[in-house]
């Protein structure tokens, strides 16, 4: 971890799953005092750190489990808890007389389980390197990429589901392979698609406002998590994109504009471009809205392309101590592919964290096409 990348202020211990929150005033880590709201606090803590959910939670006793480098406690204001998405807004220093504190196991994410060291201008990737990448196929043909958030939820782009592609029984999600023709990949059906209600082209086909290009696909049954199938992390709450940071875009899309789709998953490393630069007259002239961002090289040459839509743009960081890959962007649109001053444009996932959590909680039993604002 570099000095430029401080630890996220909420942490979960890999040793005993204790939750710890940083006290900025004192410069120390504190434990979360156990309460009747442990389930909600555990879920909120995991979500804040960029995990999809808490799998389990428990209580530990500081007298038996030890302080382990922490000093003191935070208590949760249970009255304000239902009305917040940020744990840090509803905690305050307290005594915690019983000395019992909260531990949680968050759904793991963003880590390769294998020792692994077109996208236009990209290269073939290897099995298990991007285990969250899936292929969304309609009538057997690859149309879009997607990213596993869990065994049964995939995040992708809304524009992958125009009117003509809404018979869900004709969609399949292909995972666990890098070759499109691989017999070893798993293919599952789709139970529901939740797309963003603020994605205007679905209301007006000629709208040129393409913000909110985001959708969730709920699989008909969960994929087994293996060395080749793993979920990606979401950005942590409040985690900003870093201009110039080099991240990775992956997909089976065209290796040149209106060329052939890649048979083997491609990966390309591209830097994030600031919205100020990308909105310049030479780039996209104010077309980049706040919930989008650009990534690529001013001179072009490396980019996502047709068929990569919906796929992951992932950045690695160590803000949770362990290095993890986070889904920072969803491949959305662009002018051509890999052109000078026309970088790829991505949906900014950090702006949709609450939308994602809400959709998954609300629509886990839904079937068919569902919209959520």
């Amino acid at each position: 971890r570099s000095d430029q990348e401080p630890l996220y202020p909420v942490q979960v211990s890999s040793a005993d799953a204790r939750l710890m929150v940083f006290d900025k005033t004192e410069g120390t880590w504190r434990l979360l005092c156990s309460s009747r709201s442990n389930a909600r606090v555990a879920g909120l803590s995991c979500e804040e750190m960029g995990f999809l959910r808490a799998l389990t939670h428990s209580e530990l006793d500081v007298r038996t489990a030890g302080a382990n480098g922490t000093s003191g406690f935070f208590c949760v204001d249970e009255g304000r808890l239902p009305h917040t998405q940020r744990l840090l807004e509803v905690i305050s220093v307290c005594d915690c007389p019983r000395g019992r504190f909260l531990a949680a196991i968050c759904q793991d994410c963003g880590r390769r389980k294998l020792p692994v060291d077109r996208i236009v201008g990209g290269r073939d990737t290897s099995l298990g390197r991007w285990p969250w990448q899936v292929s969304l196929r309609y009538d057997g043909a690859h149309l879009c990429g997607g990213s596993l958030l869990s065994g049964d939820w995939v995040l992708t782009a809304a524009h992958c589901f125009p009117e003509r592609n809404r018979v869900l029984s004709r969609w399949r999600v292909f995972a666990g392979a890098v070759a499109q023709a691989s017999p070893h990949g798993l293919q599952l059906g789709v139970q529901a698609v939740v797309y963003h209600g603020g994605y205007l082209p679905f209301r007006d086909p000629n709208s040129e406002e393409n913000s909110n290009d985001i959708a969730l696909v709920h699989l008909s049954s969960p994929l087994p998590l293996t060395e080749y199938i793993q979920p990606v992390c979401l950005p942590a709450a409040g985690q900003a994109l870093v201009d110039g940071k080099i991240c990775t875009v992956t997909g089976w899309g065209n290796t040149q504009y209106y060329g052939q789709q890649a048979g083997v998953l491609q990966e390309a490393r591209v830097p994030i471009i600031s919205n100020d630069v990308c909105n310049g007259a030479d780039f996209y002239g104010n077309q980049i809205k706040p919930k989008m961002f650009c990534a690529g090289y001013p001179e072009g040459g490396i980019d996502a392309c047709q068929g990569d839509s919906g796929g992951p743009f992932v950045c690695e960081d160590s803000i949770s101590r362990t290095p993890r890959w986070r889904l920072c962007g969803i491949v959305s649109w662009g002018t051509g592919c890999a052109l000078a001053q026309k970088p790829g444009v991505y949906t900014k996932v950090s702006d949709f964290r609450e939308w994602i959590f809400q959709a998954i909680k609300t629509h886990s039993e839904a079937s068919g096409m569902v919209t959520q604002l």
């Epitope: 879009c144 077309q287 996502a304 047709q306 959305s332 662009g334 026309k342």
Partner: antibody, heavy 130, light 109 residues
Framework: EVQLVESGGGLVQPGGSLRLSCAAS????????MHWVRQAPGKGLEWVAS????????YYADSVKGRFTISADTSKNTAYLQMNSLRAEDTAVYYC???????????????????????WGQGTLVTVSS | DIQMTQSPSSLSASVGDRVTITCRAS??????VAWYQQKPGKAPKLLIY???SLYSGVPSRFSGSRSGTDFTLTISSLQPEDFATYYC???????????FGQGTKVEIK
């Protein structure tokens, strides 16, 4: 720096022909729409024709359909307007303009969207008179 | 074909005035409307696209808005260099046929 330079205007008799050229530089020609817009003396702007040269897709105003042909040579970054069967009412300053385009990156054919005409040439005068 | 009806055809205003020009589309054109400024003997210049997006380098006193099929160009505080003719234009993507409004000449009062 983006530049559009028109040429080929002049005086022509009714029923005659003329070919206008628009030499483009400073942007990716293949992925831009190129347009011809005219302005009769003392009048407003009238769109004439457009081309999206990557596909070779062409579009015309009803007033010129069948008489004018828009084309592009991507190797020369040049758009052309071939004007046949010219009439007195075709007298105007002819401007070449371009607009950017974008498309989604999914695996099926997407509509290519354009936006406003962001760069214009200086115009070339076409006079149709006997 | 889609018609763009622009009004007024001309107006007189003073420096510092707030000026509003409107355009009505004969049918839905979504937000695919641009506004241009043209000075005598010069090519038009793009001011606004997608109904309300300010083109790069255009002063922020220019703004655009949409209400259904009605589109408005507003100059919040008219400057001496703003005396010119203004045109609206639709570029509705289904048809790729562009049409301009008749123009509004903004003159010095």
């Amino acid at each position: 720096e983006v530049q559009l330079v028109e040429s080929g205007g002049g005086l022509v008799q009714p029923g005659g022909s003329l070919r206008l050229s628009c030499a483009a530089s400073g942007f990716n020609f293949s992925y831009s729409y190129m347009h011809w817009v005219r302005q009769a003396p003392g009048k407003g702007l009238e769109w004439v024709a457009s081309i999206y040269s990557y596909y070779g897709s062409t579009y015309y105003a009803d007033s010129v359909k069948g008489r004018f042909t828009i084309s592009a040579d991507t190797s020369k970054n040049t758009a052309y307007l071939q004007m046949n069967s010219l009439r007195a009412e075709d007298t105007a300053v002819y401007y070449c303009a371009r607009s950017d385009s974008w498309s989604y990156k999914s695996g099926y054919t997407q509509k290519i969207y354009s936006k406003g005409l962001d760069y214009w040439g200086q115009g070339t005068l076409v006079t149709v008179s006997s | 074909d889609i018609q763009m009806t622009q009004s007024p055809s001309s107006l007189s205003a003073s420096v510092g005035d707030r000026v509003t020009i409107t355009c009505r589309a004969s049918q839905s054109v979504s937000s695919a409307v641009a506004w241009y400024q043209q000075k005598p003997g010069k090519a038009p210049k793009l001011l606004i696209y997608s109904a309300s997006s300010l083109y790069s380098g255009v002063p922020s006193r220019f703004s655009g808005s949409r209400s259904g099929t009605d589109f408005t160009l507003t100059i919040s505080s008219l400057q001496p260099e703003d005396f010119a003719t203004y045109y609206c234009q639709q570029y509705y993507s289904s048809y790729y046929l562009l049409t301009f409004g008749q123009g509004t000449k903004v003159e010095i009062k």
